[in-house]
């Protein structure tokens, strides 16, 4: 298991809400990527391919997430000040193999101008 | 260790029906796309069809679709095979295999299924 | 539907012989990184087991002497020094797309 931080910007802020951006490298083609608050699973999303190349897409913990060819995007709506934790993308790498996990995550700073509905 | 016992192989007649089972153990079952491939005598391998890993997503060989049916239970952990309307082309040993991401990588012993009048 | 070919269909061999298999695609198996080109062997009586996976990837347990090699529609199988628990018959496949299909097959005999 690999443990960092996000070499990236894994926090994207629009209308209250947040996207969490989960990248893996472009060579992976099956995985789960499950997406922490501490140590709780918030959302997870799988992507394997069957004997005939057929891509099939699952989520047991479900959240609005967004997959793209190297990185799977959670967004959290409703931000308020409990959001505030470190977050954790854990990625199960099937294929290619071997199997790996790898741990990215940061720190989400909820700041007032982040808030979906201030208080005039 | 994964095990894969095929059951339910028989003797059946043209036009009838039969249901092939397959216990699985030793893996966790749900986290697996699944598919049964036959073997006729004497000659080589042909792929029948899959299903994915929640039983929402499955495919058939040309030769089978329309009267073959996969099917899964992930509460007991046991993989289907219904086939209808039987024909002799069908005689074969059918094999229950779990797809390991990118092979078959395991394989059960197979049962023997004979359609003859 | 993509068609597998494989030559020899039979081929008799000796202990210590160095085996070559060949297969061929009717279109490129090439995916992304990868070749979707797998190798099983199949000995009399038994179900068929995995030996090679990505067209050159030899599965856990699967002796060195068993190689994969190959690339874009031409594919082989070498077993460098041939053993006699080597004897059955050998099938290439693919996943790239559906209907996966199997090679017709190769049977190794003894001379």
């Known amino acids: 298991e690999i443990n960092g931080s996000a070499n990236y910007e894994m926090f994207i802020f629009h209308n209250g809400g947040v996207q969490i951006l989960c990248k893996y490298p472009d060579i992976v083609q099956q995985f789960k990527m499950q997406l922490l608050k501490g140590g709780q699973i918030l959302c997870d999303l799988t992507k394997t391919k069957g004997s005939g190349n057929t891509v099939s897409i699952k989520s047991l913990k479900f959240c609005h997430s967004q997959l793209s060819n190297n990185s799977v995007s959670f967004f959290l709506y409703n931000l308020d000040h409990s959001h505030a934790n470190y977050y954790f993308c854990n990625l199960s790498i099937f294929d290619p193999p071997p199997f790996k996990v790898t741990l990215t995550g940061g720190y989400l700073h909820i700041y007032e101008s982040q808030l979906c509905c201030q208080l005039k | 260790e994964v095990q894969l016992v095929e059951s339910g192989g028989g003797l059946v007649k043209p036009g009838g029906s039969l249901k092939l089972s397959c216990a699985a153990s030793?893996?966790?079952?749900?986290?697996?796309?699944m598919d049964w491939v036959r073997q006729a005598p004497g000659k080589g391998l042909e792929w029948v069809g899959n299903i994915d890993e929640d039983g929402s997503i499955t495919e058939y060989s040309p030769f089978v679709k329309g009267r073959f049916t996969i099917s899964r239970d992930n509460v007991k952990n046991i993989l289907y095979l219904q086939m209808n309307s039987v024909k002799s082309e069908d005689t074969a040993t059918y094999y229950c295999?779990?797809?390991?991401?990118?092979?078959?990588?395991?394989w059960g012993q197979g049962t023997l299924v004979t359609v003859s009048s | 539907d993509i068609v597998m070919t494989q030559s020899p269909s039979s081929l008799a061999v000796s202990p210590g012989d160095r085996v070559t298999i060949n297969c061929k695609s009717s279109?490129?198996?090439?995916?992304?990184?990868?070749?979707?080109l797998t190798w099983y062997q199949q000995k009399t009586g038994q179900a068929p087991k995995l030996l090679i996976f990505y067209a050159s990837t030899r599965h856990t347990g699967v002796p060195d002497r068993f190689m994969g090699s190959g690339s874009g529609t031409d594919f082989t199988l070498t077993i460098n020094s041939f053993q006699t628990e080597d004897l059955g018959d050998y099938y290439c496949h693919h996943h790239y797309n559906a209907p996966p299909t199997f090679g017709p097959g190769t049977k190794l005999e003894l001379r």
């Open positions: 030793g893996f966790t079952f749900s986290d697996y796309w």
């Open positions: 279109q490129s198996l090439l995916s992304g990184s990868f070749h979707y």
């Open positions: 295999t779990r797809w390991g991401r990118f092979a078959f990588d395991s």
